[in-house]
């Protein structure tokens, strides 16, 4: 057993049938010795009498809020949650398997530059009684400072049957510089609590690895003469480190029809400018990548080519 | 500790097109020791961290871009002075920052180069001749070290008399190609911006 | 599977021009880009142009501007290219390729021999 | 119109050996870089499209690497249906260009 904040408490159990649980010893928060007695959740059903309560936890019946009263008066609670190990793994009930980029990938993180600022995001079909705290950090033996806003419900997808609910934290990292080579990873731990389950979930990794640009901006055709050549421009996105000239993109020009299965003219460039030939219903996008350390290709921007 | 923006002029810098080929020499060696060594702790994600560089040299200070300067993370206290007469320089006005950068990446190139062949050494003594370093690799390495030209003394090349133990100098090819890869990178843009200036 | 079937080799005077097909079958014709390269004798590859057979946009090499035209009739699924003012170093074999991607080719007919002799 | 040069333009090897060619563009070509194989009396065979994409049915022995101007077309183990003529082919600009061929013979 293990305090996850004031008052409330984690306990860890091995889940299989006839599992003898584990013995927990709860200590009412008071000067008062005697007249003290322990309920659990609304009951009014008294479980015990005396300044501590000693229980078997072995199910979800046996965790909830525990309650010390004496003469109708509340003394203090204790919280009870359930960490369930089942064959030596921690449970990943709460969480959907994202897949992506492997198996087992529940938080999946993305920085749009290297200034140290991150997004996190995990996806769940829990709709309530859901609450999830973010924490995170440079290095796990001797921790470097990240600060964690609150999650926050981003999204909400229907699947099949099934609403699909997308959360998302910001993350910051305090004294970051663009153009350190980490040599530590960065850890993000996820706490999760539905009902009385308690789970948690991690991710490690390095900045240069989640980075994804926004989409290059300004996007311009201009048509040359006696020709079906196009020549499109575009700008570096807001988002991106600067200088430029320093953290540099390249790109990748399509000119594709609306299908994925049609044809289509494709140009790599490191610069702010290509020619491709332009179709009739099709579009010109363009997307950027870190032009020396190959992480994720940002998404399309893109103009009609008419 | 930084670059100037006035440096020299674009068509000028023979440093850029090494540089460019470092990295990509670095890439794929790392690439094929990763497939090669499919199963040695080879990934990101498995090894240990190392910078054989670290207190040595002080490429991303030395070099960190002049826009950079006036964020207070990037300024580490660490201070190294080199030669400073370099011919990737190419223009006379070139700063005493832009000297101490490259001659760091020199300092650099150096002491992966001795790693590297040292390395290289006992990975031709491996009875199951698994894997080599890339000649490729390490002619490029002396390419860009030629193009910045500068004097330093010879570090020896590390001899050991003791049998090689294969599995560790694996894991320490992969512990170094990962360190190198990400300094081939840093170089990189530092020659784009010192082109683009 | 996608194939490309080319006409039979052709012997032609210098001055005169020549015109040379190639049936495509598998896939939707007009779904790819066509595109003639030529080899001669001993040498390397040369690109001479491609066409979009959906809207029958052409792009020609400078080098065989004027001289060349290339068509497509999506009726046959099959493309033409026609050279002009044939010149005895226009001997070569013609080959027809398609891709879906502009730039490059992934399948090739078999080629077509012409020969420029007086 | 850019200009691509192949080097070796002829490269003797062994069975069994690896096998590396260059191509060198004339100006900065980003990954717009493409290889060929072509057998005597056959059409070319597309290999490896943007300088380091395989194909699907093209044997894993054939890899290409490099961006801007200098690519490398490599086969790790020659087999002997390898022997035959390569060629690397720009996609930056039209019109497109070709290297003028290497042809990888048995020593």
């Known amino acids: 057993i293990w305090e996850l904040k004031k008052d409330v408490y984690v306990v860890e159990l091995d889940w299989y049938p006839d599992a003898p649980g584990e013995m927990v010893v709860l200590t009412c928060d008071t000067p008062e010795e005697d007249g003290i007695t322990w309920t659990l959740d609304q009951s009014s059903e008294v479980l015990g009498s005396g300044k501590t309560l000693t229980i078997q936890v072995k199910e979800f019946g046996d965790a909830g809020q525990y309650t010390c009263h004496k003469g109708g008066e509340v003394l203090s609670h204790s919280l009870l949650l359930l960490h369930k190990k089942e064959d030596g793994i921690w449970s990943t009930d709460i969480l959907k398997d994202q897949k992506e980029p492997k198996n087992k990938t529940f938080l999946r993180c993305e920085a749009k530059n290297y200034s140290g600022r991150f997004t996190c995001w995990w996806l769940t079909t829990i709709s309530t009684d859901l609450t999830f705290s973010v924490k995170s950090s440079r290095g796990s033996s001797d921790p470097q400072g990240v600060t964690c806003g609150a999650a926050t419900l981003s999204a909400e997808r229907v699947r099949g049957d099934n609403k699909e609910y997308e959360y998302s934290v910001e993350c910051q990292e305090d004294s970051a510089c663009p153009a350190a080579e980490e040599s530590l990873p960065i850890e993000v731990m996820v706490d999760a609590v539905h009902k009385l389950k308690y789970e948690n979930y991690t991710s490690s990794f390095f900045i240069r690895d989640i980075i994804k640009p926004d989409p290059p901006k300004n996007l311009q055709l201009k048509p040359l003469k006696n020709s079906r050549q196009v020549e499109v421009s575009w700008e570096y996105p807001d988002t991106w480190s600067t200088p430029h000239s320093y953290f540099s993109l390249t790109f990748c020009v399509q000119v594709q029809g609306k299908s994925k299965r049609e044809k289509k003219d494709r140009v790599f460039t490191d610069k702010t400018s290509a020619t491709v030939i332009c179709r009739k219903n099709a579009s010109i996008s363009v997307r950027a990548q870190d032009r020396y350390y190959s992480s994720s290709w940002s998404e399309w921007a893109s103009v009609p080519c008419s | 500790r930084n670059l100037p923006v006035a440096t020299p002029d674009p068509g000028m810098f023979p440093c850029l097109h090494h540089s460019q080929n470092l990295l990509r020499a670095v890439s794929n060696m790392l690439q094929k020791a990763r497939q090669t060594l499919e199963f040695y702790p080879c990934t990101s994600e498995e090894i240990d961290h190392e910078d054989i560089t670290k207190d040595k040299t002080s490429t991303v200070e030395a070099c960190l871009p002049l826009e950079l300067t006036k964020n207070e993370s990037c300024l580490n206290s660490r201070e190294t002075s080199f030669i400073t007469n370099g011919s990737c320089l190419a223009s006379r006005k070139t700063s005493f920052m832009m000297a101490l950068c490259l001659s760091s990446i020199y300092e650099d190139l150096k002491m992966y180069q001795v790693e590297f062949k040292t390395m290289n050494a006992k990975l031709l003594m491996d009875p199951k001749r698994q894997i080599f370093l890339d000649q490729n690799m390490l002619a490029v390495i002396d390419e860009l070290m030629q193009a910045l030209n500068f004097n330093s003394e010879t570090v020896p090349q590390k001899s050991s008399l003791e049998e090689p133990d294969f599995y560790k100098t694996k894991i320490k090819l992969c512990i170094l190609l990962h360190a190198f890869r990400i300094r081939a990178v840093t170089i990189d843009r530092v020659m784009s911006y010192l082109n683009a200036s | 599977q996608v194939q490309l079937v080319q006409s039979g080799a052709e012997v032609k005077k210098p001055g005169s021009s020549v015109k040379v097909s190639c049936k495509a079958s598998?896939?939707?014709?007009?779904?790819?880009?066509l595109h003639w390269v030529r080899q001669a004798p001993g040498q390397g590859l040369e690109w001479m142009g491609w066409?979009?057979?959906?809207?029958?946009?052409?792009e020609y090499a400078p080098k065989f501007q004027g001289r060349v035209t290339i068509t497509a009739d999506e009726s046959t699924s099959t493309a033409y290219m026609e050279l002009s003012s044939l010149r005895s170093e226009d001997t070569a074999v013609y080959y027809c390729?398609?891709?879906?991607?502009?730039?490059?080719?992934?399948?090739a007919g078999q080629g077509t021999l012409v020969t420029v002799s007086s | 119109d850019i200009v691509m040069t192949q080097s070796p333009l002829s490269l003797p090897v062994t069975p069994g050996e690896p096998a590396s060619i260059s191509c060198r563009a004339s100006?900065?070509?980003?990954?717009?870089l493409h290889w060929y194989q072509q057998k005597p009396g056959q059409a070319p065979r597309l290999l490896i499209y943007?300088?380091?994409q395989s194909i699907s049915g093209v044997p894993s022995r054939f890899s290409g690497s490099g961006s801007g101007t200098d690519f490398t077309l490599t086969i790790s183990s020659l087999q002997p249906e390898d022997f035959a003529t390569y060629y690397c082919?720009?996609?930056?600009?039209?019109?497109?260009?070709f290297g003028q061929g290497t042809k990888v013979e048995i020593k």
């Open positions: 066409i979009d057979p959906e809207n029958g946009d052409t």
């Open positions: 100006q900065s070509i980003s990954i717009n």
């Open positions: 598998g896939g939707t014709f007009s779904d790819y880009y």
């Open positions: 082919q720009q996609s930056n600009s039209f019109p497109l260009t």
């Open positions: 943007f300088a380091s």
């Open positions: 390729a398609r891709n879906k991607e502009l730039r490059y080719f992934d399948v």
